[in-house]
Interface confidence: low
Amino acid sequence: QEEDLPRPSISAEPGTVIPLGSHVTFVCRGPVGVQTFRLERDSRSTYNDTEDVSQASPSESEARFRIDSVREGNAGLYRCIYYKPPKWSEQSDYLELLVKESSGGPDSPDTEPGSSAGPTQRPSDNSHNEHAPASQGLKAEHLY
């Protein structure tokens, strides 16, 4: 019988209220044996995958998604999900990132190019159904 996958957790370092221009790292944690962690933004249609998974403890693996220079548009809801063959987990709870405005900062787009919070390319809208089960159409090679 297949094991039940525990829900992942999500946290942010150094916190969830980040000054404009500072860095933030989202940390997704799950059980050992995770192949892929995914950080989802606002809805399932926007996400980033990583297979750069490390062991946080003997019973826990983690992945880190860093935004080097947080901008106003990075504010929003984030959550994690992971793939441990042959199944995708449930989503974590949402974590809300707040960005503290600073005078004179640019009103900015929603994510840094090259940052970890958004993939470099999107899945095509034709082939990706945001409301489909998480196991559909989500292999990393579909992104790049």
Epitope: P106, D107, P113, R122
Partner: antibody, heavy 121, light 107 residues
Framework: EVQLVESGGGLVQPKGSLKLSCAAS????????IHWVRQAPGKGLEWVAR??????????YYADSVKDRFTISRDDSQSMVFLQMNNLKTEDTAMYYC????????????WGQGTSVTVSS | DIQMTQSPASLSASVGETVTITCRAS??????LTWYQQKQGKSPQVLVY???TLEDGVPSRFSGSESGTQYSLKINSLQPEDFGSYYC?????????FGSGTKLEIK
Amino acid sequence: EVQLVESGGGLVQPKGSLKLSCAASGFTFNTYAIHWVRQAPGKGLEWVARIRSKSTNYATYYADSVKDRFTISRDDSQSMVFLQMNNLKTEDTAMYYCVRENWYYYALDYWGQGTSVTVSS
Amino acid sequence: DIQMTQSPASLSASVGETVTITCRASGNIHNYLTWYQQKQGKSPQVLVYNAKTLEDGVPSRFSGSESGTQYSLKINSLQPEDFGSYYCQHFWSTPFTFGSGTKLEIK
């Protein structure tokens, strides 16, 4: 299939008003920012306005040339975006495009076919 | 506000030639630059985003590059379907201004 369909263009006198509409379909509308871009006959593209999603409190942004005259708004329940244009000037004559912003990589990735606005007496 | 200065305004070239279009930003836009192609009577389409990344389905003869605040779009071995107008646009801060455009015509 992602589609953006503009309507509401036409002939209007200087100082008049017009409201453009954009009907979106084929994507989760409420998570995307939408822009209006215009193109005067035989000229280049001009960015006009942007409205972001609920998660950013529907923040709006405008080109200096239309500030205080144009208002962008949206109705997520209907997947619609609007551009209310007041105090129109002859230089506002253009094709107006409704465009989706893709925040993965910041490009205007889906464009409507445009609606033509002519401001003339 | 960031201004985008695009050159040349027009360009005549033959099929098979290589051409380069440039946009200079008046400030640092941190590679938040997109290139579009527009055919006569049609809506624009994305060619390159983040200054250097080719949009899905765009032929590899197109490439984007940057040097400081100068951004370039290079088209190798021009094909008949490449003729039209090209625009850059920055996304660093509002207003998200476009370059003035380059009309690429067949010689």
